[in-house]
Amino acid sequence: LRPSRVHNSEENTMRALTLKDILNGTFSYKTFFPNWISGQEYLHQSADNNIVLYNIETGQSYTILSNRTMKSVNASNYGLSPDRQFVYLESDYSKLWRYSYTATYYIYDLSNGEFVRGNELPRPIQYLCWSPVGSKLAYVYQNNIYLKQRPGDPPFQITFNGRENKIFNGIPDWVYEEEMLPTKYALWWSPNGKFLAYAEFNDKDIPVIAYSYYGDEQYPRTINIPYPKAGAKNPVVRIFIIDTTYPAYVGPQEVPVPAMIASSDYYFSWLTWVTDERVCLQWLKRVQNVSVLSICDFREDWQTWDCPKTQEHIEESRTGWAGGFFVSRPVFSYDAISYYKIFSDKDGYKHIHYIKDTVENAIQITSGKWEAINIFRVTQDSLFYSSNEFEEYPGRRNIYRISIGSYPPSKKCVTCHLRKERCQYYTASFSDYAKYYALVCYGPGIPISTLHDGRTDQEIKILEENKELENALKNIQLPKEEIKKLEVDEITLWYKMILPPQFDRSKKYPLLIQVYGGPCSQSVRSVFAVNWISYLASKEGMVIALVDGRGTAFQGDKLLYAVYRKLGVYEVEDQITAVRKFIEMGFIDEKRIAIWGWSYGGYVSSLALASGTGLFKCGIAVAPVSSWEYYASVYTERFMGLPTKDDNLEHYKNSTVMARAEYFRNVDYLLIHGTADDNVHFQNSAQIAKALVNAQVDFQAMWYSDQNHGLSGLSTNHLYTHMTHFLKQCFSLSD
């Protein structure tokens, strides 16, 4: 006899997730990031679309911009000028690439409650921002930069050579936007708005990717993008700085490139203002293992920028590429010359270092067999950063405070014990001088955003706790999740397993591997998600596993740089190794194992399917890379070097999906791609398909007309429905 369950009746009312739930975004969560405007004030858009100013210290709030004003121009975004006299309202949002978009901007005068008339902004604008002080405006229109002293003033045109697809001023070209900065802008105000720095990208010699956009017209349009693929000619970048109070006086002054960088092809990677008359630029050799940080000073007498060699700091990797995914950015201290920066220590873990004179004399601030991930803020006495140190789980993020005013510096974990079960993955947003900060917890429980005192770390209030989501999930049978590790041949493979709600170890389940696996990525994270794979576990009874193998991030350089110059080898091996280990666990039906991935994950899933192991019955590749010769120079060469005979051409050729066409004969393969993918071009899938046809290998395919790398909108629904059918058929699950 077994006792009847106490919650039996309640359990009967619980239901599994449906695909519809996922496609409708029924269980999406909210986060609250304050739009800080001072040490103790922030703006937030209320549920009814009023823009409200909150003062933490007085506890008062008031509407600075009504929803009526927002609606009058169909505004979807806003920006308050630092002097609080004006607000820009953004409407007619039109997406371009990952970050870039154009929009129409209206300026609203808060002092008289009217829109600024006269000298209105042109449309559409590619980028617009206020100066950090006052209400100067800088904007980019038709690839040229303009300046306004005040919103109602006539504009001053700073650059004149801007040309579509040729010269970009103040905004990046495609490759800098996606792979280097990565932002929609390439201009930076000095702290008090005296100077404006900007990048000019010359794409005149870059080969162009052209693809058809079918639209509704009789003839398709052709989209042309200067896009440097591996080994191709790259953009030529120059950095200029202009005095914004008197810009006509000497005009834009070019910032010199360090000699050791300028001697061959190079990239500009970031610009950080230190003071109004000191700026820090980061440069990178095209062979991305040498980075130079250059600190430059304004010379009043010559009205030029001087970058002495003594203020050049070199960062070099001998085992891989410089940095993690990107070279880290410096965070300057109050003396305006020393800075904090994350880079590899002698043991090969990324840690915070303090650089006062030379990189060789850097003082290591954090250390251990874990990694510092982001420096949020440096104040006079504290440094706030995130790391995955706590309890040795690489997929967690906690926020720490190091007291830099005292010696030895003391360290405190701000978040580790706040909501330990619910929250193990945090980010933070700080007000001026770190007087207050918001913590945003992404999981593993339901996300929650809270406000804290910057001195005491005391929680002041909950900003968003997702109560509606919590209530909605009460009658849902969510899958179980576990994060564990496998130790294989001195390699630690962390994995996340998503198990059906009534998981029983004595039964056999179909296994789906979800893979990304790109260099410096991390899939195994302690975050909350109710997504497609949650549905597959909850409703369809699948086990889903995500594995972080070699090449993934935040576990040291040995794992990260293992894939250097040989993409497509160890990432695949490690997925296969993990699958074998999962089979050994006894609850996997080894005749029903699938793998799927998107983008880099599509490349890995394709190679895994074509590995000849016989492990996988079927798999899906969405928008996969198929040859590294087809992908962007900046990304590809970082990890693979150049596709030249004297460099790494051999591995470029060996690592294609097409080279393994024969091996797809014994698997069911679903290949999916958007025809208007600006990032991983449709060419990649077209070549896979051609190779499979030429090898007379049967496969399934789906294209999405006029869709980009994200396959958004109605395509998303179609995509997940289609992939669900494919997997259910593969696993012999009834519809």
Epitope: Q157, T245, G251
Partner: antibody
Framework: EVQLLESGGGLVQPGGSLRLSCAAS????????MSWVRQAPGKGLEWVSA????????YYADSVKGRFTISRDNSKNTLYLQMNSLRAEDTAVYYC???????????WGQGTLVTVSS | EIVLTQSPGTLSLSPGERATLSCRAS???????LAWYQQKPGQAPRLLIY???SRATGIPDRFSGSGSGTDFTLTISRLEPEDFAVYYC?????????FGQGTKVEIK
């Protein structure tokens, strides 16, 4: 409405000094570069001097460098031109103007006449 | 310094006619940084055009500017009685800023 009103002009002997003022209204004075431009009787226009919003940087035509000093008082919305060691060739109508970006001038005051003569 | 030469010195035209005023620079004016002003007797100059071709606020569209490098033109498409005045060009592409000597547009 933007208004600029110059004052302080008059007759002065060569070698003498004069201080011109320009009272500004109708705009955020502290945000703009301001300039002095002069026009000799029956002649063309000549830029004389400019000052940035903070007052920290000043610029002069070679013909007046070392003799003239431009300054401003943002709390009083007033621009000044201190003219020392005046010469006959400094005789002109002096205009103060809102100076856009160290570029063009708009608007201009009505001007004040400075006559340097013995 | 950049010397601006305006021509003709005087332009005699009737109302309704088209006026074309020229301004030539001794060296290239960078980025078309050129402005045009109108001055009537006993009055201060008034900005018409900046950036070689952008009309200032409140300026009628019969006034237009064009040109780049060393050659710039101010065109008044149909002269109105109030347009008879002296016109000055000014460059701000290099220091010091300089003005042309002026073109007088008078009634014929």
């Amino acid at each position: 409405e933007v208004q600029l009103l110059e004052s302080g002009g008059g007759l002065v002997q060569p070698g003498g000094s004069l201080r011109l003022s320009c009272a500004a209204s109708g705009f955020t004075f502290k945000s703009y570069v301001m300039s002095w431009v002069r026009q000799a009787p029956g002649k063309g226009l000549e830029w004389v001097s400019a000052i940035v919003p903070s007052g920290g940087d000043t610029y002069y035509a070679d013909s007046v460098k070392g003799r003239f000093t431009i300054s401003r008082d943002n709390s009083k919305n007033t621009l000044y031109l201190q003219m020392n060691s005046l010469r006959a060739e400094d005789t002109a109508v002096y205009y103060c103007a809102k100076d856009y970006y160290g570029g063009w001038f708009d608007p201009w005051g009505q001007g004040t006449l400075v006559t340097v003569s013995s | 310094e950049i010397v601006l030469t305006q021509s003709p010195g005087t332009l005699s035209l009737s109302p309704g006619e088209r006026a074309t005023l020229s301004c030539r620079a001794s060296q290239s004016v960078s980025s078309s940084y050129l402005a045009w002003y109108q001055q009537k007797p006993g009055q201060a100059p008034r900005l018409l055009i900046y950036g070689a071709s952008s009309r200032a606020t409140g300026i009628p569209d019969r006034f237009s500017g064009s040109g780049s490098g060393t050659d710039f033109t101010l065109t008044i498409s149909r002269l109105e009685p109030e347009d008879f005045a002296v016109y000055y060009c000014q460059q701000y592409g290099s220091s010091p800023r300089t003005f042309g000597q002026g073109t007088k547009v008078e009634i014929k």
